[in-house]
Interface confidence: medium
């Protein structure tokens, strides 16, 4: 299927790269504004300059454009534990990230929360913590993995998945209980 082109995309495709078609006169191609600027006035005629103005503080455009307004700078979400990696400039949005020894968990395409990397206590690091993935732990004998933490097999109930991993311990406990009742 051919993607449906909006009116703006159709108009732009008539002009050479780096130019856009004048909204009131489709025989005129105006030069797009550089990143860091926005369109204040269309070019008055062929070969004449487009009136572009620099983005105001708190806004940006990251690529050449013919936007009537700059985009608002993103704010890092403190409630998600995010910190500012680099501030917003006229040609680049704010870059948000996590602190050291934390990873990003994406709730959705635009939204991530920072969580502490697992330390693998009572286990070993199988895969190190990455920018977008928690540490992968392997647990020592007598421990099983629950929510990426190594938990003692003494906390393993028979109905849980841990029974396979903790089977020797469960049998030992059962054996001890049996010997205690004779």
């Amino acid at each position: 299927l051919v993607p449906h082109l909006g009116d703006r995309e159709k108009r732009d495709s008539v002009c050479p790269q780096g130019k856009y078609i004048h909204p009131q006169n489709n025989s005129i191609c105006c030069t797009k504004c550089h990143k860091g600027t926005y369109l204040y006035n269309d070019c008055p005629g062929p070969g004449q300059d487009t009136d572009c103005r620099e983005c105001e503080s708190g806004s940006f455009t990251a690529s050449e454009n013919h936007l009537r307004h700059c985009l608002s700078c993103s704010k890092c979400r403190k409630e998600m534990g995010q910190v500012e990696i680099s501030s917003c400039t006229v040609d680049r949005d704010t870059v948000c990230g996590c602190r050291k020894n934390q990873y990003r968990h994406y709730w959705s395409e635009n939204l991530f929360q920072c969580f502490n990397c697992s330390l693998c206590l009572n286990g070993t690091v199988h895969l190190s913590c990455q920018e977008k993935q928690n540490t992968v732990c392997t647990c020592h004998a007598g421990f099983f993995l629950r929510e990426n933490e190594c938990v003692s097999c003494s906390n393993c109930k028979k109905s849980l998945e841990c029974t396979k991993l903790c089977l020797p311990q469960i049998e030992n406990v059962k054996g001890t209980e049996d010997s205690g009742t004779t």
Epitope: S72, S74, K75, R77, S108, E109
Partner: nanobody
Framework: EVQLLESGGGLVQPGGSLRLSCAAS????????MYWVRQAPGKGLEWVSS????????YYADSVKGRFTISRDNSKNTLYLQMNSLRAEDTAVYYC?????????WGQGTLVTVSS
């Protein structure tokens, strides 16, 4: 002026259901990603669910997946959260929020109490 007004909270027994609504005004409703966020007593904010635009892609926190359903009615400018199989740990003030490159608009919240 952007306004978000939640309703539908209340007291419900464990295993019960509630449907939260969030009436939106003052902005072009379909153009924004919308969220439900909650705050349990004495705890921090917890993201619950979001619904995108276009396409209405939905996302859920693991703690509510399979029990909660987010939806939106663009003709009524309303966001919903259908909450089933409620648990005591779902007790919180629930807020709807508009995604405008940050959680820049919040409702006043609606209290959900799950208790027998």
């Amino acid at each position: 002026e952007v306004q978000l007004l939640e309703s539908g909270g209340g007291l419900v027994q464990p295993g019960g259901s509630l449907r939260l609504s969030c009436a939106a005004s003052g902005f072009t409703f379909p153009a924004d990603e919308m969220y439900w966020v909650r705050q349990a007593p004495g705890k921090g904010l917890e993201w619950v669910s979001s619904i995108g635009w276009p396409g209405g892609a939905t996302y859920y926190a693991d703690s509510v997946k399979g029990r909660f359903t987010i939806s939106r009615d663009n003709s009524k400018n309303t966001l919903y959260l259908q909450m089933n199989s409620l648990r005591a740990e779902d007790t919180a003030v629930y807020y709807c929020a508009k995604y405008g490159r940050n959680f820049d608009y919040w409702g006043q919240g609606t209290l959900v109490t799950v208790s027998s």
